[in-house]
């Protein structure tokens, strides 16, 4: 007899886009409309919740911009929280200082992406230092992952 | 009887590098020589043409440089076109303003990468705002994707 | 008879983090402690050694910073060496010039990531132009790959 048909497992993947009603950290994300993907991973209060242990490529981009450059330090972090551990683990981080000419209109992006071994129930979040300087266009600011 | 040997499907993948004879938008790419990859995806007039619906990680880097900085706004977009839709969809975008000291020789890169659900016949392109400021070295400016 | 159980192959993956005792090029990496991954790939004297030919997504981020900006040109390269070839092949590269305000404390990252067809025994390395300006925090400076 031929082998049973292969059960095609749903790929665990997420691509969430900027949500302009973020008021505090961590950033909140659009998980429903536009070019969003969410499959085999849950979204909860700004976080992507892993439900299967394994290797994941995790990425995020944040678009910072302002009208009158004051060169406030900018930071962009992807971090992980798990109830088993007392402290957040910063997985990836980007920092910028002295990045524009004082007083000028400016714009700059930070991109992060890498592979991590994640455990079921890990929660992944994105944090920025200056929320007021983030632009939330879906093509400019995003957060995603996929299971290898 | 034992099952037939597994047919190893060719991985759908592309990595195209900068082509200095780009004269207009979208950017054109080297699809033959050097560290180029093109398998299970077609290249046509600057675009990567998807021939199988599914999840893809899409990425691009563009290297901008100039002899005398005048801080022209720079943009770098990956966008999608499909004959079923009247308008291009910007998938990912990076913008830079006020990024160098007036009059100085300068150099800067923009990197984009994320996961998208693409449909057979989608055409993917890269657009930049200032073609004359792009350097097309194969290690510096590129465009690629692979099917998850 | 039913087919033999599928042998689950270990995913070939690496994520190495910054190691502050790098004294010369190529950069050296932390391959044991922290959020490091190393499976099906070897680490040797700063390099990731491929032991199975195939398609790999390769990435690196380097975090540059300084106390008093003098706009030294910065470069960040991922390159490949193989005993069959006389010369290193630069796979990806980022350059920065005129990126901060003279005399100011500054910080900036460079991110690279793309797909390559690698051959067994290829050695991959990361090079930077100004070692003294690199910060080696594990979340900020890293080097990784995975087999597609």
């Amino acid at each position: 007899p031929s082998p049973p048909p292969e059960k095609k497992e749903l790929r665990k993947v997420a691509h969430l886009t900027g949500k302009s009603n973020s008021r505090s950290m961590p950033l909140e994300w659009e998980d429903t409309y536009g070019i969003v993907l969410l499959s085999g991973v849950k979204y909860k209060k700004g976080g992507l919740v892993i439900n299967e242990t394994g290797l994941y490529f995790v990425y995020s981009k944040v678009y910072f911009r302002g009208q009158s450059c004051n060169n406030l330090p900018l930071s962009h972090k992807v971090y992980m929280r798990n109830s088993k551990y007392p402290q957040d683990l910063v997985m990836m981080e980007g920092k910028m200082m002295s990045y524009c000419t004082t007083g000028q209109m400016w714009a700059r992006s930070s991109y992060l992406g890498a592979v991590f071994n994640l455990t079921s129930a890990d929660h992944l979040y994105v944090n920025v230092s200056e929320l007021s300087l983030v632009n939330f266009e879906e093509s400019q600011t995003f957060f995603g992952l996929y299971k290898l | 009887p034992s099952p037939p040997p597994e047919k190893k499907e060719l991985r759908k993948v592309a990595h195209l590098t900068g082509k200095s004879n780009s004269r207009s938008m979208p950017l054109e790419w080297e699809d033959t020589y050097g560290i180029v990859l093109l398998s299970g995806v077609k290249y046509k007039k600057g675009g990567l043409v998807i021939n199988e619906t599914g999840l893809y990680f899409v990425y691009s880097k563009v290297y901008f440089r100039g002899q005398s900085c005048n801080n022209l706004p720079l943009s770098h977009k990956v966008y999608m076109r499909n004959s079923k839709y009247p308008q291009d969809l910007v998938m990912m975008e990076g913008k830079m303003m006020s990024y160098c000291t007036t009059g100085q020789m300068w150099a800067r890169s923009s990197y984009l990468g994320a996961v998208f659900n693409l449909t057979s016949a989608d055409h993917l392109y890269v657009n930049v705002s200032e073609l004359s400021l792009v350097n097309f070295e194969e290690s510096q400016t590129f465009f690629g994707l692979y099917k998850l | 008879p039913s087919p033999p159980p599928e042998k689950k192959e270990l995913r070939k993956v690496a994520h190495l983090t910054g190691k502050s005792n790098s004294r010369s090029m190529p950069l050296e990496w932390e391959d044991t402690y922290g959020i490091v991954l190393l499976s099906g790939v070897k680490y040797k004297k700063g390099g990731l050694v491929i032991n199975e030919t195939g398609l790999y997504f390769v990435y690196s981020k380097v975090y540059f910073r300084g106390q008093s900006c003098n706009n030294l040109p910065l470069s960040h390269k991922v390159y490949m060496r193989n005993s069959k070839y006389p010369q290193d092949l630069v796979m990806m590269e980022g350059k920065m010039m005129s990126y901060c305000t003279t005399g100011q404390m500054w910080a900036r990252s460079s991110y690279l990531g793309a797909v390559f067809n690698l051959t067994s025994a290829d050695h991959l390395y990361v090079n930077v132009s100004e070692l003294s300006l690199v910060n080696f925090e594990e979340s900020q400076t890293f080097f990784g790959l995975y087999k597609l």
Partner: antibody, heavy 119, light 111 residues
């Protein structure tokens, strides 16, 4: 409440320098770039320049280079502007104004400092 | 630099009527979907006060009788219905690039 308090009026002789101050209160001083504006009868309002209250470097209108020098003291939340080699043309009211980087315009202004140059 | 030309230099409007002030820029002050034009009100002995930012957005605490419109190079400030307390000088100002410039001002009198 948010306030930008400028130093008092100055009556000075031609050829000397004057340094005027602008103290911010009611907000995080280093979060906002500080701009300076000149108002004279002859030329309405003129933008002089801007200083980063965070890192202390300034950007000047070409017309005021060599005339104005902007500095900042983060510890006292105060911005300063020194005007050099004064002439009667420099007689005017000088304003400081903060500019939120995430906004479009100068939202709070100091009350102004009158500088009169006369022999 | 971008030159802003305001007109009229002065106008007198009856209480309750509409006052319209124009500002023309020597080049576009638009970028990326926004118009970088602002309007200020200044009364004697006081600093300028922000009324309208980004061409048409009312600053917090400013009465709704003030409105702004326009894009590119042509912008308008409207006040309707004019009230006694609106007697002042009005300035347009762009923040598209450095150096910022201001219009010459329009003095509004209430009849």
């Amino acid at each position: 409440q948010i306030q930008l308090l400028q130093s008092g009026a100055e009556l000075v002789r031609p050829g000397v320098s004057v340094k005027i101050s602008c103290k911010g209160s009611g907000y995080t001083f280093t979060d906002y770039a500080m701009h300076w504006v000149k108002q004279s009868h002859a030329k309405s309002l003129e933008w002089i320049g801007v200083i980063s209250t965070y890192q202390g470097d300034a950007n000047y209108n070409q017309k005021f280079k060599g005339k104005a020098t902007m500095t900042v003291d983060k510890s006292s939340s105060t911005a300063y502007m020194e005007l050099a080699r004064l002439t009667s043309e420099d007689s005017a009211i000088y304003y400081c104004a903060r500019f939120p980087d995430w906004d479009y315009a100068m939202d709070y202004w100091g009350q102004g400092t009158s500088v009169t140059v006369s022999s | 630099e971008i030159v802003l030309t305001q007109s009229p230099a002065s106008l007198a409007v009856s209480l309750g009527q509409r006052a319209t002030i124009s500002c023309k820029a020597s080049q576009s002050v638009d970028y990326d979907g926004d118009s970088y034009m602002n309007w200020y009100q200044q009364k004697p002995g006081q600093p300028p006060k922000l009324l309208i930012y980004a061409a048409s957005n009312l600053e917090s605490g400013i009465p709704a009788r003030f409105s702004g419109s326009g894009s590119g190079t042509d912008f308008t400030l409207n006040i309707h219905p004019v009230e006694e307390e609106d007697a002042a000088t009005y300035y347009c100002q762009h923040s598209r690039e450095l150096p910022y410039t201001f219009g010459g001002g329009t003095k509004l009198e209430i009849k």
